[in-house]
Every structure is written in C-alpha cells, then in structure tokens.
Amino acid sequence: MGRARDAILDALENLSGDELKKFKMKLLTVQLREGYGRIPRGALLQMDAIDLTDKLVSYYLESYGLELTMTVLRDMGLQELAEQLQTTKEESGAVAAAASVPAQSTARTGHFVDQHRQALIARVTEVDGVLDALHGSVLTEGQYQAVRAETTSQDKMRKLFSFVPSWNLTCKDSLLQALKEIHPYLVMDLEQS
C-alpha cells in the first residue's frame, strides 16, 4: 500500500516552509486515536517533508497516517490538498480490503508480538526489564513511566500493548529481542505453539 505514503509525501511537499512548520505544530496537538503515541516534539520539528512522511507512516501506519494528515490539512484550511488525499484513501481502501482476504492466512504471518498478544500479557512477569530495553528507542519517557506506574505485570503489559498500534516493524522487533533476552523459554514456547 505504498500509494498512501506517496500521497502523504506529495501533499507535504506542496506545503510552503511556513505551512510545513504549522503542520508540525498542529500534529503536536491534534487528537489521536486511542493507543497511538505522539511523535516526539524534538525530532518532529527538525524533519523535512520526506522524514516527516516516513515518521507518519512508521508511527501511524499508512491508513491512519493518511487520515491524520487529512485532518491536520483540513484544520489548516487546506481543503483542496485534503480532498486529494481523500481520493487516494478511497482508492487504497479498496486495495487494502482486497489484500486482507482471506484473513485466516494473513493472521499467521503477523508479527510475533501481534500474534501472541494475549499470551504475552498473561505470562510476561519481568516487565521492568522489557521496559528498560525499550526506553527511549521505542518508548518515550512518558510512555515508559505510564507503563511502570501500573501495579500488576498484566496491567503493565496491557498498557505496553496500548502503544503497539503506532509501532513500526523495528519497534516490534525490539520488543521481541527484549523478550528473547528476558524470557527466552516463554518465547521458544510461543514460537513452537
């Protein structure tokens, strides 16, 4: 579904320097869907259109990234650009729907982290070690503290998984790597199940 990424990039490259700056500021305050994290301000403000497109896609995936870009552009009064994205969204929506059939076959090829969400929530006990491995590189300070503030291991893991929808493959791989180091037998068990 690379079309969505290309469409976001086209839209952002059509913005003037001031408009791109305004887009970033609005992105810092726009209401996000439950479970999605915010791109860190420091990194965001330094990005050009290409970097920002990559960041939007890695944080929010293509579908929601496209929707979010449309929302911000509308907030800025740039209806025309938003409409162009709407067209792309509708076209790529049909492609996405076709690609997701049959669901059974794709479910098994999902990332380990997504496949075994329930088991990981139930069985990971050393959550602090996992959090430490993800601090900064995957989890912001606020996310890290929010997970650690939960009282039980299950609640901590549930909170951690609430951030997963905004993660890219690298982030999920980092979590898997941390789990392999801290709970090697659990990972082996789940991989064989």
Epitope: P40, D132, A133, G136, Q145
Partner: antibody, heavy 118, light 111 residues
C-alpha cells in the same frame, strides 16, 4: 573497544554559543542514547539531558531546557551539544556518556572544558 | 525531583579495611524487580567510571571487592578490602524519573 572522544577545550565570549562534539566508535551508534553531564571544578555531577540517536528523541533536565540543545549525526556517529547565551556560570567541564540499559552511563568521554570570558 | 544524599562526605580508611558509603533517596527508586540506583568512581582529571548498576550488579571488569546493596530509599556501596588505587570520589545516581540526579559524592582516602 567502545570509545567516546570529545572535542577540545573552548574559550568563548559571554553571550555567544558553542557546539561541542562527542565522536563514538566501537559500537552501533543508533542502538544507544547519549547523555551529557556538567561538572564544576571540585564539585558534583549534574545531568543535562539525553538523546536517543536512533530516532532523535530528546529529554532535558528542566534546568537546562533553554541552555542546551542535543543533536546527532548518524553518518559520523557523533553526538553534539550546543550551549547558548553563555555566561561565566557555564564555564566548566562537560562530559558525554553512553546510556546503557536501566539508564546508567557505562562509557564516558574524557570531557570538554568550556571557558567563558571577555 | 528526587534528591540523593550521600554520607559521609569524606572518609579515610586503612588499607585492607572496609569502606562503606551510603546513599539515601528522598523517595523510593525501586520496583519489585529492579532498583534504579547506580554507582560511579571518579579519579582526579578523569571522567566517572560505572562500577555498579541496578544497585547490586557489578559492571564488567570491575573488581569483586566492590559490592552494592539496598532497595527502596537506602543504598550502600562497600569496598573490601580497600586498595590504594581506590582513592577517588564515589557518586550514586538514580534513573527512576526525570531529571536523573547524582548524589553529592563521597571522597575516599586510603590511609
């Protein structure tokens, strides 16, 4: 062997800015964060802030938010700290260090001495 | 901010004896799994060197005469038996929350 090599001593005028560097080697730069620490002569250590160079994520000690700006260049495996609106109070030694798991600092640079004088 | 109070400020210990340095945090820096307290040694003209992380885990290459203990708010660094090369200033550091803070330091002298 992990090494952090900091730039040389700086002598600058009050009110000006300075950008010091911390060149790393011996490990994958983007897998770790870099933190910066201030130490006045004969005194303790003060945490300034950190940058996770893989994603540019930064956090600062509130005290240094308007003083320090942390950046990095992955192509040269180098972290930078820019200090602005310099005063004599900024004259001291600054260390960079690598952030290990648990946010302890396992490898340190040799320090950069900053002198602010008119 | 969490304040770390080290004691004593300075200490003179005879060669071969035990040196004990204390670090007290103004609030707990421990979970059920880990204590986010670390210890460093700094010699004059040199950067600090990590000795112990997570309150009690000895860093690779650090002699076994160094040990750390404690949880919650009270932590201790022990050196036994002390050697001449242990003359230095020792700092504790927490990484529980921002801002990360260091203790005021303990200057250790070997008699």
């Amino acid at each position: 062997e992990v090494q952090l090599q900091q730039s040389g001593a700086e002598l600058v005028r009050p009110g000006s800015s300075v950008k010091m560097s911390c060149k790393t080697s011996g490990y994958t730069f983007t897998n770790y964060g870099i933190t910066w620490v201030k130490q006045r002569p004969g005194q303790g250590l003060e945490w300034i802030g950190y940058i996770y160079v893989g994603n540019g994520y930064t956090e600062y000690n509130e005290k240094f938010k308007d003083k320090a700006a942390l950046t990095s260049d992955t192509s040269s495996s180098t972290a930078y700290m820019q200090l602005t609106s310099l005063t004599s109070d900024d004259s001291t030694i600054y260390f960079c260090a690598r952030i290990a798991q648990g946010r302890c600092f396992d490898y340190w640079g040799q320090g950069t001495t900053l002198s602010v004088s008119s | 901010d969490i304040v770390l109070t080290q004691s004593p400020a300075s200490s003179a210990v005879s060669l071969g004896q035990r040196a004990t340095i204390s670090c007290r945090a103004s609030q707990s820096v421990s979970t059920s799994s880990y204590s986010y307290m670390h210890w460093y040694q700094q010699k004059p003209g040199q950067p600090p060197k990590l000795l112990i992380k997570y309150a009690s885990t000895l860093e690779s290459g650090v002699p076994a005469r160094f040990s750390g203990s404690g949880s919650g708010t009270d932590f201790t660094l022990n050196i036994h038996p002390v050697e001449e090369e242990d003359t230095a200033t020792y700092y504790c550091q927490h990484s529980w929350e921002l801002p990360y803070m260091f203790g005021g330091g303990t200057k250790l002298e070997i008699k």
